[in-house]
């Protein structure tokens, strides 16, 4: 067991998940904990419980290991940290990491007011609705590190986007969610298309039908639980 | 299955796995207490890397057998708080040198056998 004395501790290591933070339902998932060379031991903890451990081969690179998810469920979604030791001493803790676990109960339809396409600096609204109650959804972009939104909502929710700009376009997907890290099937990609201004250009994003598991977020938390891009996302309003 | 040993005795427990992927399997030992949660008791590695819990350390080993497809957990010095169902539970695949301590690591279990040590 760790024993961690607050004079003497080693750097906090770095944690982080592939091929995403989020993972279907089933899947499987691979969490990084990188410490350092003289590293003898890593240890995983899962919601403040010890979840696995590893002890580095000298022959191996010792100043990271793979800690694997066989099978993603709901008991495996939630926050993660790691710690490593060398010698007789413990790192400090490693920042939390949250999985969120997909592919839950029910798919959420999708649509976009007043239409998909639009010209610059009209003002957009994003629904998600989902039969199964839930207490919160989630409007995700595709390749949009950050670019996340959540709002409260029983069966249906809203997303205003204000007046668009050519950062607004791309396809987006929402949710509903059980708890934070526990979120339906996603729905149906809904690409937004901006035309006017300037190039008065409608490009859609490269590869719109991009697979989850190569879709680029980073669920760090706010008091929310989850952290927005404030430049872009600002609607914290709660029903 | 019902294992029933004396205060002080020992017991191996074991647990044969069907299919093809037990070597890259990591496999543990927990156990439930009548009125207690399920808890860790022992776990091994696909490379043979062994952790124990702190109540068991020293009285219980676990190792493998992977040409028998098999986890042993070889329980001495019973004492009557050791007694519980014992369960076996793998992780299938796995990586490396990973050992889970956590339940919810595991994706599949055995039907459990219950030891009861007499005082």
């Known amino acids: 067991q760790r024993i961690n004395t607050e004079k003497e501790t080693l750097p906090k290591p770095i944690i982080w998940a592939k091929p995403s933070i989020m993972v279907t339902n089933g899947n499987s998932v691979n969490i990084w904990c990188q410490g350092a060379q003289s590293a003898s031991e890593y240890q995983l903890y899962f919601e403040g419980s010890f979840f696995a451990l590893e002890r580095p081969k000298p022959s191996r690179s010792m100043n990271k290991v793979r800690f694997f998810i066989s099978q993603m469920t709901s008991h495996t979604a939630g926050i993660y940290t790691c710690f490593y030791q060398s010698g007789e001493l413990w790192s400090k803790s490693s920042n939390p990491l949250k999985l969120v676990v997909t592919g839950l109960y029910d798919t959420p339809n999708l649509w976009v007011y007043p239409r998909p396409e639009v010209t610059l600096g009209e003002n957009v609204t994003f629904f998600c609705q989902l039969k199964t109650a839930t207490s919160k959804f989630f409007l995700l972009k595709e390749r949009g590190s950050n670019h996340i939104q959540n709002k409260y909502g029983n069966i249906q929710a809203e997303f205003p986007m204000g007046p668009v700009t050519r950062a607004h376009r791309g396809t987006y997907r929402c949710f509903g969610s059980y708890n934070d890290y526990a979120w339906s099937f996603p729905s149906e990609p809904v690409t937004l298309l901006i035309t006017g201004g300037v190039e008065n250009s409608s490009l859609a994003p490269t590869d719109p039908t991009s697979s989850l598991d190569y879709w680029e977020f980073d669920l760090s938390t706010n008091e929310s639980g989850l952290q927005k891009d404030s430049a872009f996302w600002d609607h914290t309003t709660q029903n | 299955e019902v294992q029933l040993v004396e205060s002080g005795g020992s017991l191996r427990l074991s647990c044969a796995a069907s299919?093809?992927?037990?070597?890259?399997?990591?496999m543990g030992w927990f156990r439930q207490a009548p009125g207690k949660e399920r808890e860790f008791v022992a776990a091994?590695?696909?490379?043979?890397?062994?952790y124990y819990a702190d109540s068991v350390k020293g009285r219980f080993t676990i190792s493998r057998d992977n040409a028998k497809n098999t986890v042993y957990l070889q329980m001495s010095s019973l004492r009557a708080e050791d007694t519980a169902v014992y369960y076996c539970?793998?992780?299938?695949?796995?990586?490396?040198?990973?050992?889970?301590?956590?339940?919810?690591?595991?994706?599949?279990w055995g039907q459990g056998t219950l030891v009861t040590v007499k005082p």
């Open positions: 539970a793998a992780v299938v695949p796995t990586y490396g040198n990973n050992i889970y301590v956590h339940s919810a690591a595991y994706n599949y």
């Open positions: 299919g093809r992927t037990f070597a890259s399997a990591a």
């Open positions: 091994i590695s696909r490379s043979d890397d062994t």
